[in-house]
């Protein structure tokens, strides 16, 4: 799987999950989140050659099309597969509130 | 929705479904399919700016990150959303066989 275990420990050039830290204030303009100040969101990057973690029958077809037509603009793209939630703390007035923000962290990628 | 109805009738520059015809023999090297000779597979293409058909909480965050950090390599990507099957005819010996190939045609796209 193109997950953090594999991708972070390799020099994979093809589609893989990459490290990305997002600072809530600086990168998103979200000042209201108390904790954490930011988080490791990660992102997906890299080419999707034929047979590389292809998601559907269509992405297999498209990768094969790309192989037969190099330079074509139609190609599969490296996107998130498994996403995880992020627990945050924010204040409603002076009362802290804990909430899970769903689908915030990329754990693995796929070619779609 | 970024579907064929909208995208094929507009000059949308952002993520949208685009027309693509795939010839089974020429583009994929599949000689075994008797009918059709090819099909309109379509593909997804175009930038994914802030709020453009974003798929998950993560893609909203990433698009917002991108807005605050122009030129960053981390950005949502335009990929298939709704896929449809394609009926094909091929021969097993001299006996024709009809089969549905699932997830072969892109009907709409999303930013993931």
């Amino acid at each position: 799987a193109l997950d953090t275990n594999y991708c972070f420990s390799s020099t994979e050039k093809n589609c893989c999950v990459r490290q990305l830290y997002i600072d809530f204030r600086k990168d998103l303009g979200w000042k209201w989140i108390h904790e954490p100040k930011g988080y490791h969101a990660n992102f997906c990057l890299g080419p999707c050659p034929y047979i590389w973690s292809l998601d559907t029958q269509y992405s297999k077809v498209l990768a094969l099309y790309n192989q037969h037509n190099p330079g074509a603009s139609a190609a599969p793209c490296c996107v998130p597969q498994a996403l995880e939630p992020l627990p945050i703390v924010y204040y409603v007035g002076r009362k802290p509130k804990v909430e899970q923000l769903s689908n915030m962290i990329v754990r693995s990628c796929k070619c779609s | 929705a970024l579907d064929t109805n909208y995208c094929f009738s507009s000059t949308e520059k952002n993520c949208c479904v685009r027309q693509l015809y795939i010839d089974f023999r020429k583009d994929l090297g599949w000689k075994w399919i008797h009918e059709p000779k090819g099909y309109h597979a379509n593909f997804c293409l175009g930038p994914c700016p802030y709020i453009w058909s974003l798929d998950t909480q993560y893609s909203k965050v990433l698009a917002l990150y991108n807005q605050h950090n122009p030129g960053a390599s981390a950005a949502p990507c335009c990929v298939p959303q709704a896929l449809e099957p394609l009926p094909i005819v091929y021969y097993v010996g001299r006996k024709p066989k009809v089969e549905q190939l699932s997830n072969m045609i892109v009907r709409s796209c999303k930013c993931s």
Epitope: W32, V92, G93, R94 | Q57, V61, L64
Partner: antibody, heavy 121, light 111 residues
Amino acid sequence: QVQLVQSGAEVKKPGASVKVSCKASGYTFTSYWMNWVRQAPGQGLEWMGQIFPASGSTNYGEMFEGRVTMTTDTSTSTAYMELRSLRSDDTAVYYCARGIGNYALDAMDYWGQGTLVTVSS
Amino acid sequence: DIQMTQSPSSLSASVGDRVTITCRASESVDFWGNSFMHWYQQKPGKAPKLLIYLASNLESGVPSRFSGSGSGTDFTLTISSLQPEDFATYYCQQNIEDPLTFGGGTKVEIK
């Protein structure tokens, strides 16, 4: 410039529901909390609740809990407030208002023009 | 809920007058070194407009004749020299506790 444009006036029967929309422009919609405040004829201001568009996180005033639902559509930068089981004392002007962004509960720096909801049999 | 009591509920004044409106919270609205108290102006048929946030900070574009002061439970909005466009209703608002609450309003009328 920042603008919040609300849907038009509504007349509803007691027991019915109303859904008011608020279309935002001129700022990053997913970076600010959107509040809903109402004002009965000749009365003061009453906070109903709020929503953070990027996550769908909500905080509702206790008085409205269970009767109000706040939602957003980030693709159109539009916030919605639905109030159910309407009574005659729900007759009011309903405002959407953007929080200034430092906290969840906050001062509100931009307001919609208001939507008059009349509940009458 | 935190109750916000404004006084007076209405007042008559002339152009050029110094006007003071007070707001008392039923408990302290101080937290993290800030006073979570704000002031709005509302004209008939219009939406409220933010004047002062965090007790004493003037909102961008608001004339400097408006000022706010106070801490804990007692707060004041002052208009140093009343102008014709200042005749309106003024509200205080706290955001230290859910639900966010407003004062009952002070109507400033022409004498």
